[in-house]
Amino acid sequence: SERCDDWGLDTMRQIQVFEDEPARIKCPLFEHFLKFNYSTAHSAGLTLIWYWTRQDRDLEEPINFRLPENRISKEKDVLWFRPTLLNDTGNYTCMLRNTTYCSKVAFPLEVVQKDSCFNSPMKLPVHKLYIEYGIQRITCPNVDGYFPSSVKPTITWYMGCYKIQNFNNVIPEGMNLSFLIALISNNGNYTCVVTYPENGRTFHLTRTLTVKVVGSPKNAVPPVIHSPNDHVVYEKEPGEELLIPCTVYFSFLMDSRNEVWWTIDGKKPDDITIDVTINESISHSRTEDETRTQILSIKKVTSEDLKRSYVCHARSAKGEVAKAAKVKQKVPAPRYTVEGGGGTGGLNDIFEAQKIEWHEGGGHHHHHHHHHH
């Protein structure tokens, strides 16, 4: 056979479908790889051919379009399963060709099983709702094209094992599920089951998504630097380790990039010669507000280092803030003679740098270590 432009296995499209449910799968060539659509290709005399490789096999084989009740069929650039079976799992290839042109792409299709509470290995899309924000809706996803607009399906919504009925603040409204006022208790997995008739048969489409209740933009504030602050002075003797935490609270903001960084004498730590290490950790509240802590560490601080300006900066979509740490060199306590009287030991405690306890909130923690010379 003549040469064919082979786009390989498109693993970006990890298609997962439920067992015993209809599935319509569009050939990815027209969506991601070619600059023309199926209609144009068809008008130009190109033919779309489908074949597949079963799971754990190497042999490419044609798809059987002569199964009872047309279980697998092709319509334009769509491969239809009515319904899927577990052993339909495999790599599917669509090839567009005529005598002079050929282009093909393969993609994995996984048929997955679900239990009675809709648990499955299916990767779930996440829908974020703002906490206490007024009415917000989620819509049963990926059901377009399965039945004509003349067909009126029945839609049942579930949270886990339970049908959504009589809930305090969640109301099923056909394809939509309305949250009158979203609360933390509304976090979880929601499933819509769409039931529709076709040629005397009844089909079900199951779609599950994760709802995550997040901080409301009404309550969002610019970054808040909790540390360094005016109450803590970092007093060190040369040769000691200097540790300064920068702890910043960020309100949740959709698609906002939160940044924290230190400057030393106005320069990024990368751009100066002193041996400084920055350790970062991130924690999230239940509503995805974020606390970032960057600990600046100088193992053996010098007199020069103790004269520098250490400033913590933070930025989000809500604004930028900065705060300087109070750093000074510890003044050695005067030596008293015996006659000079005791009772001064406490002075050392007053001048001692306050110790800061660093508490990471609950949630997910990510640690990053940067070493700068």
Epitope: D115, S116, C117, N119, M159, G160, C161, Y162, K163, I164, Q165, N166, F167, N168, N169, V170, S185, N186, G188, N189
Partner: antibody, heavy 122, light 107 residues
Framework: QVQLVQSGAEVKKPGSSVKVSCKAS????????IQWVRQAPGQGLEWMGY????????DYAQKFQGRVTITADESTSTAYMELSSLRSEDTAVYYC???????????????WGQGTLVTVSS | EIVMTQSPATLSVSPGERATLSCRAS??????LAWYQQKPGQAPRLLIY???TRATGIPARFSGSGSGTEFTLTISSLQSEDFAVYYC?????????FGQGTKVEIK
């Protein structure tokens, strides 16, 4: 360790109502459902209904519709099952049961209360 | 609603012997079936869910099998503490329904 503690035995007259309580201790942060199941003397188990305390959702078995009301007080982690228009055949041990989450298929009756005997007699 | 039928109603077995209990559903419940054990004066205890998965703390002598409409609970070697009533329950369709129970008694 999650535990369910039910209210004590009750003797009721036909036509009256009974309200059985079920207090959960060591409750997880995630929503869960409380199920109610009854067992007449020497008989099998019969599911009556459920409530999801933190979300308010509930449902009842067809047989008990109109006679049973299941409620919950989240502040005290207590669920209640009220059965009205009692008759002698309602004499049974009433159990509450629950799972850890709303998602555990097959484990929605993971933890059981000790049961409450309700005797209906004139 | 789905009707669950258990057999036999009573099973007489000697300690150390194998006991096999059956449960039939009036329509397919896939693998959405649980087994419970109940001793006199006690609440039921979950033994098996998903037709074959043992619940936490349940000894290995208890095993479940089957799918669709036919299910079996097997106790490989009966101990004195296993003499009790056993119930199956389907949770494939609402309302969730129980079988009428099988009493396992000492022979």
């Amino acid at each position: 360790q999650v535990q369910l503690v039910q209210s004590g035995a009750e003797v009721k007259k036909p036509g009256s109502s009974v309200k059985v309580s079920c207090k959960a201790s060591g409750s997880p942060a995630e929503p869960y459902a409380i199920q109610w199941v009854r067992q007449a003397p020497g008989q099998g188990l019969e599911w009556m209904g459920y409530i999801i305390p933190s979300l308010g959702g509930y449902d009842y078995a067809q047989k008990f519709q109109g006679r049973v009301t299941i409620t919950a007080d989240e502040s005290t982690s207590t669920a209640y099952m009220e059965l009205s228009s009692l008759r002698s055949e309602d004499t049974a041990v009433y159990y509450c049961a629950r799972g850890q989450t709303l998602y555990d298929s097959g484990r929605q009756f993971d933890i059981w209360g000790q049961g409450t005997l309700v005797t209906v007699s004139s | 609603e789905i009707v669950m039928t258990q057999s036999p109603a009573t099973l007489s077995v000697s300690p150390g012997e194998r006991a096999t209990l059956s449960c039939r559903a009036s329509q397919s419940v896939s693998s959405n079936l649980a087994w419970y054990q109940q001793k006199p004066g006690q609440a039921p205890r979950l033994l098996i869910y998903g037709a074959s998965t043992r619940a936490t703390g349940i000894p290995a002598r208890f095993s479940g099998s089957g799918s669709g409409t036919e299910f079996t609970l097997t106790i490989s070697s009966l101990q004195s503490e296993d003499f009790a009533v056993y119930y199956c329950q389907q949770y494939n369709n609402w309302p969730w329904t129980f079988g009428q129970g099988t009493k396992v008694e000492i022979k």
